[in-house]
């Protein structure tokens, strides 16, 4: 059974001090969202016993295996059903605690009733505050039965449930008809799936004979031991104040387990801790009684004394539950109550015995669950005991169950049953996950879901280049940590597989499925430097750079230019996709902006070192375009341009620039400055005769402005070829009479 305990603190003077704690003794319990198990859950279950809504309860996690619920503000918050869920996968288990109000009209004589299939269960509700009205019994929140208030027997209302079956299990309540449901008596009925002393799918298997009030689990035949007892058959008492399947937990506080209710996985239910009894578990056992709820009687013989926590304490020379066995009868010594082996291993099991006459090798035998008897292969004889060693054939899953070591001499016989758990080594169900990659290393998460049994003791990561026949490289890692595979080849695919191991010999599982992980390209190492740059307009910048000369091929796919506009907090990135490029034109920039510029080489997704930065100031944008540009041929070599000044000027114009281009020509245009900004007319001279020209112009203040519309005009016919256009300006008012 899962090692899960729900503790309720029943010191109820103040509900704000009330708390519930769920403790798991499972390996890796409650760690949370990783692959090694879901978290512990502790909550109030309002599906059956509904209470008025109140402030939310506070959940506090104490480490990985404990969770506590607090924040109860009034007594009614406590009434009802609480549950703790723990364990992983098929072992996920719910432990239930039912809380009754101490001031209720009806109180349960006993809250938890565990009965066998076919038994008669009797629930008894004791009258605490009488009402002369019907008593309604409910099962799992639905009407079940009615009793007349006259039907009380000795101040108790009884509900008899004959021939109970597992579906009868659940929460029962007894309520006076006119009372609040919070004044009900709440019960928990647990019906085992088998008759008394039997377990298994067809109830064909025999229970081990649980001692000290332990209850045989109907699914796996294990004893669910009361708090304070341990061992396969609950034969061993824990030290006072301890609980858990291995007595590993300790009751909080100075008064030990006083005032605590312990709830364990079904079919046990809830009880006080060992040595305590009463509705609030605050009363010590009466003399002669011991155990959980003080339900057990000592009946010690041969001078044994009764301890309320552990039972009979025997004098020297006697042993047994009631000190009824003489030490002269042979006795199995120090046999572990539970052993764990891995599937297909061939373990050695030792069994030691003492007695008078002294046990010899042939008098000790080992019996498997299927009835097979193994004889010891060797025995070690010491003055006080004989230890027989048994070599077990290769284990199969069917070997899980109760084994028995038996010693027989003429002085009598003794046997000790112990549980053997055959565990299946874990096998990953999925491939490991790549977290990050570099050119020579891969960071891998080995945490994957697995079949078989935990806990995981080690994780091995096997890897080798894809399609390689070389040996696998192996790295052993901690189960909870990510792994870095080092010293790999760049731009190479690696096949990576996980192998999980659990504790013990033969705990290594098969390798999991492979996955392909590829290392990144090598990082580019060369640092470019900026040769120069020049502004080609208010929004255009030409940049050139160089790389140091190194032997061998260039490691790089291209360049990344970065422009940082600190004022606006914006970065512009320009990708130059040729590693041979050494210049680039950046367009669409913001005029009048101060940029920081750098360049770096890239390879795949990796960036090399950036060049030292340069600081570039783009000129602000120029004025609007001149208006109403007009061209008029004056001769075979002259054309006059007229225009109007731009509107809404941001400042005084410093000059105009005229662009002259032969229509349909392939050559570069010619730019001519008009240095007298007050002019609105100019004559372009030195043109070719009978030639069609295109003209446009723009103004300049601090920077060049927008171009005007383009105008066409042809020179007049048949002059000589001129040397090239020149310009003469006049104010428009002076006329053009020369």
């Amino acid at each position: 059974a899962v090692d899960l305990t729900l503790l309720a603190n029943l010191r109820l003077t103040d509900p704000q001090r009330f708390f519930l704690t769920c403790v798991s003794g499972e390996a890796g319990a409650g760690r949370g969202s990783d692959a090694w198990g879901p978290p512990l859950l502790l909550e109030k279950d309002d599906r059956i016993v509904r209470t008025p809504p109140g402030p939310p309860l506070r959940l506090a996690r104490n480490g990985s295996h404990q969770v506590t619920l607090r924040g109860f503000s009034k007594p009614s918050d406590l009434v009802g059903v609480f549950s703790c869920v723990g364990g992983a996968g098929a072992r996920r288990t719910r432990v239930i605690y039912v809380h009754n109000s101490p001031g209720a009209h009806l109180l349960p004589d006993k809250v938890t009733h565990t009965v066998n299939k076919g038994d008669t269960a009797v629930l008894s509700a004791r009258v605490h505050k009488e009402k002369q009205t019907d008593v309604i019994w409910k099962s799992n929140g639905s009407y079940f039965y009615t009793l007349d208030w006259h039907e009380a027997q000795d101040g108790r209302f009884l509900l008899q449930l004959p021939n109970v079956q597992p579906p009868s299990s659940g929460i029962y309540s007894a309520t006076y008809l006119e009372a609040s449901p919070l004044g009900s008596a709440f019960f928990r009925l647990i019906v085992r799936g088998c008759g008394a002393g039997r377990w298994g799918p067809g109830c064909t298997k025999e229970c081990p004979g649980c001692l000290h009030g332990g209850v045989c689990h109907d699914h796996d035949g294990e004893c669910v031991c009361p708090p304070g007892f341990t061992g396969t058959r609950c034969e061993q008492a824990c030290r006072e104040g301890r609980f858990g399947q291995s007595c590993q937990e300790q009751c909080p506080g100075i008064s030990g387990c006083r005032g605590l209710t312990f709830c364990l996985p079904d079919p046990y239910g809830c009880s006080c801790g060992s040595g305590w009894r009463g509705s609030q578990c605050q009363e010590a056992c009466a003399p002669g009684h011991f155990g959980a709820d003080c339900r057990l009687q000592c009946q010690c013989q041969n001078g044994g004394t009764c301890d309320r926590f552990s039972g009979c304490v025997c004098p020297s020379g006697w042993h047994g539950v009631h000190c009824e066995k003489s030490d002269r009868i042979p006795q199995i010594l120090n046999m572990a109550s539970e052993l764990e082996f891995n599937l297909e291993t061939m373990p050695r099991i030792n069994c030691a015995a003492a007695g008078n006459p002294f046990p010899v090798r042939g008098s000790i035998e080992l019996r498997k669950p299927d009835g097979t008897v193994l004889l010891s292969t060797k025995a070690i004889v010491e003055p006080e005991k004989t230890t027989a060693e048994f070599e077990v054939p290769r284990l199969v899953l069917a070997d899980s169950g109760f084994w028995e070591c038996r010693v027989s001499t003429s002085g009598g016989q003794d046997s000790r049953r112990f549980k053997v758990n055959v565990k299946v080594p874990p096998v990953p169900l999925a491939a490991p996950r790549l977290l990050t990659k570099q050119s020579r290393q891969l960071v891998v998460s080995p945490l994957v879901s697995f079949s078989g049994d935990g806990p995981i003791s080690t994780v091995r990561l096997h890897y080798r280049p894809q399609d390689s026949t070389m040996d696998w490289s192996t790295i052993v890692v901690d189960p909870s940590e990510n792994v870095t595979l080092m010293n790999l080849r760049p731009k190479t695919g690696y096949s990576v597989r996980v192998q999980l191991s659990r504790p013990g010999e033969g705990g290594e599982g098969a390798w999991g499925p492979p996955t392909l992980m590829t290392t990144d390209c090598p990082e580019p190492l060369l640092q470019p430097w900026l040769e120069g740059w020049h502004v080609e307009g208010t929004d255009r910048l030409r940049v050139s750079w160089s790389l140091p000369l190194v032997p061998g091929p260039l490691v790089g796919d291209g360049f990344l230019l970065r422009l940082w506009d600190g004022t606006r907090g914006q970065e512009r990135r320009e990708n130059v996709s040729s590693p041979q490029a050494r210049t680039a034109l950046l367009t669409g920039l913001t005029p009048g902006t101060h940029y920081q510029l750098d360049v770096q080489l890239y390879h795949c997704t990796l960036l090399g070192p950036a060049s030292p930065p340069a600081h570039v100031l783009l000129p602000p944008s120029g004025p609007p375009a001149p208006r109403h540009l007009h061209a008029q041929a004056l001769s075979d070599s002259e054309i006059q341009l007229t225009w109007k000044h731009p509107e809404a000027l941001p400042g005084p114009i410093s000059k105009y620039v005229v662009e002259v281009q032969v229509a349909g020509g392939a050559g570069d245009p010619l730019w001519i400055d008009v240095d007298r900004p007050e002019e609105t007319s100019t004559i372009i001279r030195g043109l070719n005769a009978s030639t069609r020209y295109l003209f446009r112009m723009r103004a300049s203040i601090q920077g060049l402005g927008d171009w005007s519309n383009t105008v066409e005009e042809s020179t007049l016919g048949n002059g000589l070829q001129a040397e090239g256009p020149v310009q003469e300006s006049r104010a428009a008012e002076e006329g053009l009479d020369q």
Epitope: R50, I136, Y143, L147, E178, P181
Partner: antibody, heavy 127, light 102 residues
């Protein structure tokens, strides 16, 4: 499906006796409180008697106390009403009904209700 | 005994209209112990409302109950043709259980 089927009604002279039966099916009869309600021709409903699931507790209307006896046989899923010293004013359709209990809000007290009724059997007391 | 008095004795309405039926107890009744039943000619009564305001299984939501203490009301928000019937209130608070006159 829950069903209640009354039988045993008929014509009887004043002072005579009659035994009504109610056969129940479709639910766990032995868990429920059961009762008889009657309705005189053209009149309203009048509660007559009820009996607890165990048969241990019974209650009667003043008008029938001492003359009528309610009983049940849980093994046969049957409710009975033994009517003695019948009078003309006992003439009515007799219905058997199941008492159920509802958890109306989940937080407040339980609310009862007669949730299933038989089709009724007519008892006529006349000379 | 607690007397249950219903009013009006007869309510004449048409389909689609709203019906309001009143039930008054001679002494205070816990709202948990007040039920309403519907009876059509030649049929057994049918439980409509329990606990003064909770609808029984299968009862349409046009039926609603309210009230506390001595005054209780059954409301049919929009009458359907099949709603024309005799309605009874009943108290369970003290023995004997008593019905209104309908």
């Amino acid at each position: 499906e829950v069903q209640l089927l009354e039988s045993g009604g008929g014509l009887v002279q004043p002072g005579g006796s009659l035994r009504l039966s109610c056969a129940a099916s479709g639910f766990t009869f032995s868990s429920y409180k059961m009762g008889w309600v009657r309705q005189a021709p053209g009149k309203g409903l009048e509660w007559v008697s009820w009996i607890y699931p165990s048969g241990g507790g019974t209650t009667y209307a003043d008008s029938v106390k001492g003359r009528f006896t309610i009983s049940r046989d849980n093994s046969k899923n049957t409710l009975y009403l033994q009517m003695n010293s019948l009078r003309a004013e006992d003439t009515a359709v007799y219905y058997c009904a199941r008492v159920n209990y509802y958890d109306s809000s989940g937080y407040g007290p339980i609310a009862p209700g007669l949730d299933y009724w038989g089709q009724g059997t007519l008892v006529t007391v006349s000379s | 005994d607690i007397q249950m008095t219903q009013s009006p004795g007869t309510l004449s309405l048409s389909p689609g209209e709203r019906a309001t039926l009143s039930c008054r107890a001679s002494q205070s009744v816990s709202s948990s112990y007040l039920a309403w039943y519907q009876q059509k000619p030649g049929q057994a009564p049918r439980l409509l409302i329990y606990g003064a305001s909770s609808r029984a299984t299968g009862i349409p939501d046009r039926f609603s109950g309210s009230g506390s203490g001595t005054d209780f009301t059954l409301t049919i928000s929009r009458l359907e043709p099949e709603d024309f019937a005799v309605y009874y209130c009943q108290q369970y608070g003290s023995s004997p259980w008593t019905f209104g006159q309908g």
